[in-house]
């Protein structure tokens, strides 16, 4: 089986305040089994932005139908962006278990927020 890669193609994304930001993430393998989670920031204090298995995440929607078993697109859209949303977002694959354990991370996408057009 192919080794899993997590592809976050955009190093950075710039969005105007009030708009939605799309953060792209695709995986190259269905294995190992386990959820994808999105985090803002790295290290112990990173904040959970989206988890397939829990919620709701009111401002976050998935671009694809992530419940389909063959889905490999885990891109998300974050609505009504504000300057407080700026930061680096990581798409991370977890291996199923009790608890799930982190398997591999994408390289991250830096979100910057422009002033709302007047």
């Amino acid at each position: 089986e192919e080794e899993l890669q997590i592809i976050q193609p955009d190093k950075s994304v710039s969005v105007a305040a009030g708009e939605s930001a799309i953060l792209h993430c695709t995986i190259t393998s269905l294995f190992p089994v386990g959820p994808i989670q999105w985090f803002r920031g790295a290290g112990p204090a990173r904040v959970l932005i989206y988890n397939q298995r829990q919620g709701p995440f009111p401002r976050v929607t998935t671009v694809s139908e992530t419940t389909k078993r063959e889905n490999m697109d885990f891109s998300i859209s974050i609505s009504n962006i504000t300057p407080a949303d700026a930061g680096t977002y990581y798409c991370i694959k977890f291996r199923k278990g009790s608890p799930d354990t982190e398997f591999k991370s994408g390289a991250g996408t830096e979100l910057s927020v422009r002033a709302k057009p007047s």
Partner: antibody, heavy 117, light 108 residues
């Protein structure tokens, strides 16, 4: 409004145990790391322990092996199990919410732990 | 472990005056330095992070500067509610998160 309310402090003898709790409300507890910071009487702040959103735990060297941090996401509650307490553990213990920047943006009012024979 | 040294230990200032105090790190922390205010009997309150970014709701009279190992917190015109103890904290990505010993700002 974000609220953190600590409880469980009190007077114990050296070598005894105590379990602190911190009830959180006003934010999505499961999405954030949370931490304990203590302050001995008349002294400065000392970071004690942190638990990440995925449950990974971190400790100051001064408490490693004696204290255990845990969280119950279903109850939005943070815990600190303190074993083998020493006089130098006497302090007000604060819990705090941690931002992705590794700073502590909301704090509880604290609970006093006194270790004395 | 990164050691933070704050100076002076105590600062006597008159209301309306400018107050400036410093925090020195034993090794570089880039811009990852925060400042907290603590009044007697209260929990600390986050003022500044990333060396110079004010936290939500913090008045503009509070400003932070510096990078690397030398940092400064300035209160441009001291109000009565600003008399308190101020702590710096390094917030690099990994624990332990260390605090300075504090600077007490008292009324002159």
């Amino acid at each position: 409004d974000v609220q953190l309310v600590e409880s469980g402090g009190g007077l114990v003898r050296p070598g005894e145990s105590l379990r602190l709790s911190c009830a959180a409300s006003g934010f999505t507890f499961t999405n954030y790391a949370v931490t304990w910071v203590r302050q001995a009487p008349g002294e400065g702040l000392e970071w004690v322990s942190l638990i990440s959103v995925t449950g990974t735990t971190y400790y100051a060297d001064s408490v490693k092996g004696r204290f255990t941090i845990s969280r119950d996401n279903s109850k939005s509650t943070l815990y600190l199990q303190m074993n083998g307490l020493r006089a130098e553990d006497t302090a007000v213990y604060y819990c705090a919410k941690v931002t992705w920047k590794n700073v502590f943006d909301y704090w509880g009012l604290g609970t006093l732990v006194t270790v004395s024979s | 472990e990164i050691v933070l040294t704050q100076s002076p230990g105590t600062l006597s200032v008159s209301p309306g005056e400018r107050a400036t105090f410093s925090c020195r790190a034993s090794q570089t922390v880039g811009s990852k330095l925060a400042w907290y205010q603590q009044k007697p009997g209260q929990a600390p309150r986050l003022l500044i992070y990333d060396a110079n970014t004010r936290a939500t709701g913090i008045p503009a009279r509070f400003s932070g500067s510096g990078s690397g190992t030398e940092f400064t917190l300035t209160i441009s015109s001291l109000q009565s509610e600003d008399f308190a103890v101020y702590y710096c904290q390094q917030h690099t990505d990994w624990p332990p998160y260390t605090f300075g010993g504090g600077t007490k700002v008292e009324i002159k």
